[in-house]
């Protein structure tokens, strides 16, 4: 007695797919696989299959139902922090070859990495023209200010909204200042935050306000404090620089904007007699901390002249190092003072029309604004590698 197995029904390829191998008929133990065209994927129901092979059974049926070749769906694109996504191909279309365009919030953010155009590729990932599958980055625009020029030298002035949007007030032990970098870092002086280096959360960081005592400000908290390894507390002010990492990104607007770091060419805007601007809530001529944010335009002082001014007692020799720059008037009267520590001495880059930080308020004579003495600032351009390393590592 013999019996022959039933041949199986001829497999009809699903739309956008093909059968392999193609045979005249399929009998017991014969098999076929389904392969989808580029941009289509094997689906059983709505579950993806890595591959599909069916085997002909003794009763003349296939052991698995035919799958579908469904167009690849990259799914809804991820939201872009400080940006948005626009659909180019069609409203909400997220399937193979669909195009989306990321863009950053105008004025205050600019796109890094790529042009923001992404295509849904056959692998199911949104991919940029450079082949990146990660999101672009909306980086805050730095150095925007309501002030357009440094102007001439004049007395300490009250700042207006948007003049110094990078200005940060640091409270925690003493009053100090800092300058916002990017949207989650603050540049300041090492001596201003030294006591909090192991207790970063003790720092009360405020921005977006002009009035020191105002209840209206943007609160930020510190995640970590990084003090330059070359700084020695109570042994001079060389390497008087620190970075504070904020535990959250701040929202950038006309009153909260980061300061730019100096470009390689920045020294050409920081020569002797070039004007820098220092701002802060430090002591004024009346001997009290300022209620309103104040600023003063002061010229860079020749380095040798400044070194000589601080060579005589009570200052130890070598107080002024190559990592410092000096600014002020020989006649005195214009200076930063206690409470301004850590704040930025900024300069206008006339090529980019952006303000950048050239110095950090560090130290000076016992009596602020003293004739023949100058304010001494940490020379930021010497620390660009250090700043970039910290920010990229953390």
């Amino acid at each position: 007695y013999t019996s022959t197995a039933q041949p199986c029904p001829y497999p009809m390829a699903p739309p956008n797919g093909h059968v392999s191998p193609v045979q005249a008929k399929y009998i017991l133990k014969d098999s076929f696989s389904i392969f989808c065209e580029t941009g289509y994927e094997l689906l059983q129901g709505h579950l993806p299959l890595k591959s599909f092979t069916a085997v002909c059974q003794k009763d003349g049926s296939w052991d698995r139902p035919m799958p579908a070749c469904s167009i690849v769906d990259c799914g809804p694109p991820d939201d872009l922090p400080s940006g948005r996504v626009e659909y180019i191909t069609g409203p909400g279309v997220t399937t193979y070859k669909a195009v989306i365009q990321y863009s950053c919030e105008e004025t205050f953010y600019t796109m890094k990495v790529n042009d923001g155009k992404y295509v849904c590729e056959a692998d199911g990932f949104w991919t940029s023209s450079k082949g990146e599958k990660s999101l672009p980055v909306c980086e805050p625009v730095c150095g925007l200010s309501a002030r357009t020029t440094g102007g001439r030298i004049y007395g300490g002035q009250k700042a207006k909204p948007g003049d110094f949007p990078w200005q940060v007030l640091i409270l925690g032990g003493t009053t100090a200042a800092g300058a916002l970098l990017y949207d989650n870092w603050v540049l300041t002086a090492a001596h201003a935050v030294y006591e909090q280096k192991h207790d970063a959360s003790a720092l009360d960081i405020r921005m977006g306000t002009l009035k020191r005592l105002s209840p209206h400000y943007t609160q930020a908290w510190s995640e970590a404090v990084f003090i330059h390894e070359g700084y020695t507390h109570d042994a001079g002010f060389d390497n008087d620089i620190a970075l504070i990492k904020l535990n959250n990104k701040v929202v950038i607007n006309s009153n909260i904007t980061p300061i730019c770091l100096p470009r390689k060419e920045a020294e050409s805007f920081m020569r002797t007699d070039d004007i820098g601007t220092a701002s802060g809530w430090g002591l004024t001529q009346r001997g009290f901390l300022a209620r309103n944010l104040m600023y003063v335009d002061i010229p860079i002082v020749d380095h040798q002249k400044c070194t000589a001014a601080y060579e005589k007692p009570p200052y130890p020799r070598g107080s002024v190092t190559a990592n410092m720059l000096c600014a002020g008037l020989e006649s005195g009267g214009k200076d930063s003072c206690r409470g301004d520590s850590g704040g930025a001495l900024v300069f206008l880059d006339s090529e980019t029309e952006r303000w950048f930080v050239g110095g950090i308020v560090s130290w000076g004579s016992m009596n602020c604004g003293e004739a023949g003495q100058y304010g001494v600032y940490t020379k930021v351009i010497n620390y660009i590698p250090w700043i970039e390393n910290i920010i990229s590592d953390f």
Partner: antibody, heavy 117, light 111 residues
Framework: QVQLVQSGAEVKKPGASVKVSCKAS????????MHWIRQAPGQGLEWMGY????????DFNQKFKDRVTLTADKSTSTAYMELSSLRSEDTAVYYC??????????WGQGTTVTVSS | DIQMTQSPSSLSASVGDRVTITCRAS??????????IHWYQQKPGKAPKLLIY???NLESGVPSRFSGSGSGTDFTLTISSLQPEDFATYYC?????????FGQGTKLEIK
Amino acid sequence: QVQLVQSGAEVKKPGASVKVSCKASGNTFTNYWMHWIRQAPGQGLEWMGYINPNTGYTDFNQKFKDRVTLTADKSTSTAYMELSSLRSEDTAVYYCTLQLGRNFDYWGQGTTVTVSS
Amino acid sequence: DIQMTQSPSSLSASVGDRVTITCRASQSVSSSRSTYIHWYQQKPGKAPKLLIYYSSNLESGVPSRFSGSGSGTDFTLTISSLQPEDFATYYCHQSWEIPYTFGQGTKLEIK
């Protein structure tokens, strides 16, 4: 913040046409999609079609394809929906809704169109 | 066209109740990556407001008492503890294919 302001209520006779406008303000988007959705009294929502004001590309619910015209004026950021051969069952509130991202992100206040002899 | 069927069409409940509204699509509205169902709330005389997108994602600013679930053809909107401001009409909506369609709505009333 985007705002969509629609034209005022209309009363039309059967067989006539109505043209509803929708002006977008506070909008700096280049690629967005303006949809039109209607809601008859006491009824649900019915999608009519969309236009990309940047390219003029349109797509429609086949139910309305022969009667609806969607246009846009980029210079004034205004979209228009014209419905012809009106009948009593077209009495409804007509909404424009702007889709930037995944959904109908912003809605107009609605325009009541009454079709009555 | 994809038909969206909501149930119940109306529902009476009290403040503090847990409420579930269901929506069934006439064909699958899911891909391997996402589910193209969204939920809207509409109050009388107002435009609809998005609550849940892609089946289970809570729209920014919407209270966490709202949640959505489901894939394929069956979906639910749940309000964990009804508040007075939640009495409104709720619509499910599919954006899987054109023409986009909505459920007929579920009117949630105070008991």
